[in-house]
């Protein structure tokens, strides 16, 4: 199709080389006047538009994304050619940063319902640059944590070194929806709730004598509880003896609950004590079996191919540890009678 009629938007993604970050493009379809197909909330010129659906369909995933190759080749369907780019409804997610993401991206409705709809498309010219050392040293992270129940703030990474007074007007989105009355470079949250978690996008306009473009950053906001003050506790095994049958295989499970820690390095391992000797056993990897805001339950099994007489003289010890301390639970095997 002819893309010369598409509305054009220029975006800049300045990524940090020292952190993982994502990026998004919204399918910014033009105003209803330009095409009856494209739905928009009518807003004043001062107000930024919502980025979501258009008239032609109630299905928000009814848009097609293409990339325009720089060599003039035909448009390429994003889904077929770019595994690191994911389409979610009207949004294109870039999972990894890199200058190779620079280029022109075009979106338009899948269903063309009238001749007027042909021009219902947007061309986004994306420029991707690594952040230079001259940039602000203490810029906000693209991953920000808010402590549940307390006061916090969400900062726009590309503007976090500017004071509120000198900061330009910012447009914020949360999970793809416009936050129409948030326009400063830092959103203050007086009391953090779990619903504050999500993907936030902040945009502001930068201009020079020739043109203007939108500078965009994506912030993943996580709501967390305070770090635990407790060492992990072992939920299983509860008993210190276990009845077994000689010659049969045996699996002993160790399940431990670890309280939340922002920097989480849980240890869960099995070792064997035999008179004065003790050694760690190589056992299958630990796995998380339940995770909540407050804690995580991790399980690790020790597997004996068959129980021997020697095993009855040993103690099997589960050892768990976090940054606060450690806990152990030992199990003595006992032969089942009759």
């Amino acid at each position: 199709f002819n893309i010369s009629g598409c509305s054009t938007k220029k975006l800049l993604w300045t990524y940090s080389t020292r952190s993982e970050e994502e990026f998004v493009l919204f399918c910014d379809l033009p105003e209803p006047q330009k095409s009856h197909f494209c739905h928009r909330n009518r807003l004043s010129p001062k107000q930024v538009p919502e980025h979501l659906p258009f008239m032609g369909s109630n299905d928000l995933s009814d848009v097609q994304w293409y990339q325009q190759p720089s060599n003039g080749d035909p448009l390429e369907d994003i889904r077929k050619s770019y595994p690191h780019i994911i389409q979610d409804k009207c949004t294109l997610h870039f999972l990894t940063p890199g200058v190779n993401n620079s280029g022109s991206y075009i979106c338009r409705p899948k269903m063309i319902k009238s001749p007027y709809d042909v021009a219902c498309c947007v061309k986004m010219i994306l420029e991707v640059k690594p952040q230079t050392n001259a940039s602000c040293e203490y810029s906000a992270s693209h991953k920000q944590d808010l402590l549940l129940g307390s006061t916090g703030s969400i900062s726009c990474p590309s503007l976090s070194c500017q004071s509120d007074a000198q900061s330009p007007a910012v447009t914020w989105y949360k999970n793809g929806k416009l936050l129409s009355v948030e326009r400063s470079n830092r959103i203050v949250v007086d009391e953090v709730y779990d619903y504050h978690q999500g993907t936030y996008v902040c945009d502001y306009t930068q201009s020079d004598t020739v043109s203007s473009w939108t500078v965009r950053a994506v912030v993943q906001v996580r709501t967390i509880v305070g770090d635990t003050k407790l060492k992990p506790d072992i939920l299983d095994p509860v008993e210190d003896t276990l009845e077994v049958e000689l010659g049969k295989p045996l699996t002993i499970s160790c399940k431990a609950r670890f309280g939340f820690e922002r920097v989480f390095n849980p240890v869960i391992k099995w070792y064997i004590k035999d008179s004065d000797l003790e050694w760690e056993v190589s056992v299958p990897e630990a796995k998380s079996i339940k995770s909540t805001l407050k804690d995580e339950i991790i399980e690790r099994n020790i597997i004996l191919e068959k129980v021997t007489q020697r095993d009855l003289r040993r103690k099997f010890v589960c050892f768990v540890q976090n940054s606060i301390g450690n806990t152990t639970q030992s199990v003595q095997l006992k032969e089942k009678r009759g």
């Epitope: 739905h39 909330n41 807003l43 919502e50 979501l52 659906p53 008239m55 109630n58 299905d59 928000l60 969400i154 914020w172 949360k174 929806k177 416009l178 936050l179 129409s180 009355v181 948030e182 326009r183 400063s184 959103i187 203050v188 949250v189 007086d190 009391e191 953090v192 709730y193 619903y195 504050h196």
Partner: antibody, heavy 123, light 107 residues
């Protein structure tokens, strides 16, 4: 308890302006967005706009754009809605209503409402 | 703007009846739908948010369901204090819009 107390009834002539106040108490004023909704006699509810008391940022319904101004005074925990160039069809009860979730948020619902201010526009 | 269409516009029912009010959005609004009750001369009161979550202090006889474009408010056993006008409202995008209302009257 959380309360929104609005200013008293007003009678205005066509072409004039009216400024309605809404004083909040019982919660942190800057933590919640405030909506304005009106209801003409015997009619349904009509959303006019929203203000963020922290920064004073507003979004207005297109219908009222250019005629409505929402402001706030954080020192008195009060929001104001001024409507200008009044006409007879602006005769209505005007309500302020608190957003139900701590900002920033998707609009969740208006969980506390003022008692309403009757504005009559008549020549 | 997203149009919200409520039906019926009025209904007559008796105490103890099960009452159902429907609301349809002109486009998909996910579950961004709220229900309000308004009595004559009073301000509206939030009953249901996010299509199906019961607002604190609201009796459990009120329930909401639906997502996308079609939504329902159900009063399982109508009580004398439930005779009022009910409004749906979308909070998916600005301008926020309300349905025309359903007046529940005594039969």
């Amino acid at each position: 308890q959380v309360q929104l107390v609005q200013s008293g009834a007003e009678v205005k002539k066509p072409g004039a302006s009216v400024k309605v106040s809404c004083k909040a108490s019982g919660y942190t004023f800057t933590s919640y967005y405030m909506h304005w909704v009106r209801q003409a006699p015997g009619q349904g509810l009509e959303w006019m706009g929203i203000i963020n008391p922290r920064g004073g940022y507003t979004t207005y319904a297109q219908k009222f754009q250019g005629r409505v101004t929402m402001t706030r005074d954080t020192s008195t925990s009060t929001v104001y809605m001024e409507l200008s160039s009044l006409r007879s069809e602006d005769t209505a009860v005007y309500y302020c209503a608190k957003e139900g979730r701590v900002s920033p948020t998707d609009y969740y619902g208006m969980d506390v409402w003022g008692q309403g201010t009757t504005v009559t526009v008549s020549s | 703007d997203i149009q919200m269409t409520q039906s019926p516009s009025s209904l007559s029912a008796s105490v103890g009846d099960r009452v159902t009010i429907t609301c349809r959005a002109s486009q998909s609004i996910s579950s961004y739908l709220n229900w309000y009750q308004q009595k004559p001369g009073k301000a509206p009161k939030l009953l249901i948010y996010d299509a199906s979550s019961l607002q604190s202090g609201v009796p459990s006889r009120f329930s909401g369901s639906g997502s996308g474009t079609d939504f329902t408010l159900t009063i399982s056993s109508l009580q004398p204090e439930d005779f009022a006008t009910y409004y749906c409202q979308q909070s998916y995008s600005t301008p926020l819009t309300f349905g025309g209302g359903t007046k529940v009257e005594i039969k």
